[in-house]
């Protein structure tokens, strides 16, 4: 007894096509691209039916159902728009990912299409959703403002400025990503094994402000070349935060220097440093203070400190800043803060130095502030961030 002629399901085809199907004859069903075999709502990899001796097929005909990529993944600090139609997630549907404007950006164009493999796919073939990366280095601060010799900062001037509080100590740091803080190794060395006891505050101008964004450290990474109590070479550390902070006008990372940034940090070029450290009056600043200071000649700085503190070395991993006449400097309590420069090409601020050490007499003539030269540590920073 022959089996009934099989009729291909919509969006499917049958092979082989025969005039008659008798005992042990078989046919397979294939779906058009963008459709998948379903039987009893269960996805099938393949389908073959066999004609039985009673003249019936051993399996009912499956259906060819349009591929559904499902709802796209949520995009932290962004959103997704359905382009093809409201909530349409089937084959060839298009969605558009966008980041929250001003404070986040994405590297791709954010357009994804539902492809035949059931994945939302970008034009570059990426299956993972895009990432909204924090914008860095935007500030309301302009160079030319007349710490020691400093002025109070205004909201949005230094949104990367971070206050690090221990039980009895205070230092600073700079946000360089939404979950990474750059600081001086000496400022956090004692906390390296007890990171959780470090209190991290951001989004503030007043040191004692009750309105701050709290962050907690997950781990502290001290540069392996730093030796505590034996000079300040490699005085650099990274703090990984337990959670990402939300970027806004008062909390934003500072950029890391581009390779070309070295040309913006030559002698006499002006940078800006902010902090809550000691002021001219010898008291910790209540309000975040900043000072615009020029980079000092490295040889001059080295000579000054060789005379002042024999045995203390100003290495190639350091840069000096300050006026020969004195009066403008960072001081105790500013440690770990960022010495920042404006990149004229991108119009973004980048961190060129980290407040490290200097003369006991902050702001004294011919006694410069010494900063960790960040550009020397870009590979180290990138390695830590990518691996942890």
């Amino acid at each position: 007894r022959p089996c009934p002629d099989p009729t291909a399901p919509p969006n499917g085809s049958i092979s082989p096509v025969q005039a008659i199907y008798v005992l042990k004859d078989r046919f397979s069903v294939f779906c058009k691209t963008g459709f998948e075999l379903l039987q009893g709502s269960v996805p099938l990899k393949s389908f073959t039916a066999v004609c039985q001796k009673d003249g019936s097929w051993d399996r009912p005909m499956p259906e060819c159902s349009i591929i559904d990529c499902g709802p796209p993944d949520d995009l932290p600090n962004g959103h997704v728009d359905y382009i093809t139609g409201p909530e349409v997630t089937t084959y060839k549907a298009v969605i558009q990912y966008s980041c929250e404007e001003t404070f986040y950006t994405m590297s791709s164009n954010g357009k994804y299409v539902c492809e035949a493999d059931g994945f939302w796919t970008s034009s570059k073939g990426e299956k993972l959703p895009p990432v909204c990366e924090p914008v860095c280095g935007l500030s309301t601060h302009t160079i030319g403002g007349r710490i020691v010799g400093g002025q109070p900062a205004k909201p949005g001037d230094f949104p990367w400025q971070v206050l690090l509080l221990g039980q009895t100590t205070a230092a600073a740091g700079a946000l360089i990503h939404d979950n990474w803080v750059l600081t001086a190794a000496h400022a956090v060395y004692e906390k390296r094994m007890a990171a959780s006891s470090l209190n991290i505050r951001m989004g503030i101008l007043k040191r004692l402000s009750p309105h701050y964004t709290q962050a907690w450290p997950e781990e502290i990474f001290i540069h392996e070349g730093y030796t505590h109590g034996a000079g300040f070479d490699n005085d650099i550390a990274l703090i990984k935060l337990k959670n990402k902070v939300t970027i806004n006008g008062s909390i934003m990372p500072v950029c890391l220097p581009r390779k070309e940034a070295a040309s913006l940090m030559r002698t006499d070029f002006t940078g800006t440093v902010a902090g809550w450290g000691l002021t001219q009056k010898g008291l910790l600043a209540r309000n975040l203070m900043f000072v615009d200071i020029p980079i000092a000649d490295h040889q001059k700085c080295t000579a000054v400190y060789e005379k002042l503190y024999p045995g203390v070395r100003v290495s190639a991993n350091m840069l000096c800043a300050g006026l020969e006449t004195g009066g403008k400097d960072s001081c105790r309590g500013d440690a770990g803060g960022a010495l920042v420069f404006l990149d004229n090409e991108t119009q973004r601020w980048f961190v060129g130095g980290i407040v490290s050490w200097g003369s006991i007499n902050c702001g004294a003539a011919d006694q410069y502030g010494v900063y960790t030269k960040v550009i020397n540590y870009i590979p180290w920073i990138e390695n830590i961030i990518s691996n942890f």
Partner: antibody, heavy 122, light 107 residues
Framework: QVQLQESGPGLVKPSETLSLTCTVS??????????WGWIRQPPGKGLEWIGS???????YYNPSLKSRVTISVDTSKNQFSLKLSSVTAADTAVYYC??????????????WGQGTTVTVSS | QSVLTQPPSVSVSPGQTASITCSGH??????AYWYQQKPGQSPVLVIY???KRPSGIPERFSGFNSGNTATLTISGTQATDEADYYC?????????FGAGTKVTVLG
Amino acid sequence: QVQLQESGPGLVKPSETLSLTCTVSGGSISSGEYFWGWIRQPPGKGLEWIGSIYYSGSTYYNPSLKSRVTISVDTSKNQFSLKLSSVTAADTAVYYCARSLKAARRDAFDIWGQGTTVTVSS
Amino acid sequence: QSVLTQPPSVSVSPGQTASITCSGHKLGDKYAYWYQQKPGQSPVLVIYQDTKRPSGIPERFSGFNSGNTATLTISGTQATDEADYYCQTWDSSTGVFGAGTKVTVLG
């Protein structure tokens, strides 16, 4: 983000009917056209699929349990339920409710409840 | 209804590759799914339709299915991968699970 929560008595007497409810939060049970399932795990043993229900009410059951199982859906309460009759000690298990990965497909289960322990004992 | 057979246990050193097999009659003709279950927790889908990874599952988890055997491979195994792993398929509209494999990460 869709979350599932099982609820029901933790102790059932032999020969009685076990009744569990799964409450869906963070999304409507009827909006995504998903399948919703029940899976159980006896103590120290593996997983066993009990059955699945489509948002519209169509059901599929494990043949080994089919005569004792009823799964229903109540879209107004955003819940679906399991009833297992004539229980014995062999029905003692952690019972999980879960949601299918893709709409309109009985595919993998990608969202699970935390599970509820049911003990059958007199 | 098919039976899925898994080895009861697999041991692996950190950083090494763990392979868990799941055998069943003509399993390669059907889709295989894999779940990870840690003690006291609900199962988590790690592989669906033989080879696909849900979002959030690390790339070190991969799947393959051919002939009568599906395989879950964990490359560069980490201590956090220690768990029970279950394979699953759909056979004639019925969901079928393997008995599970306990993966132990040594050290």
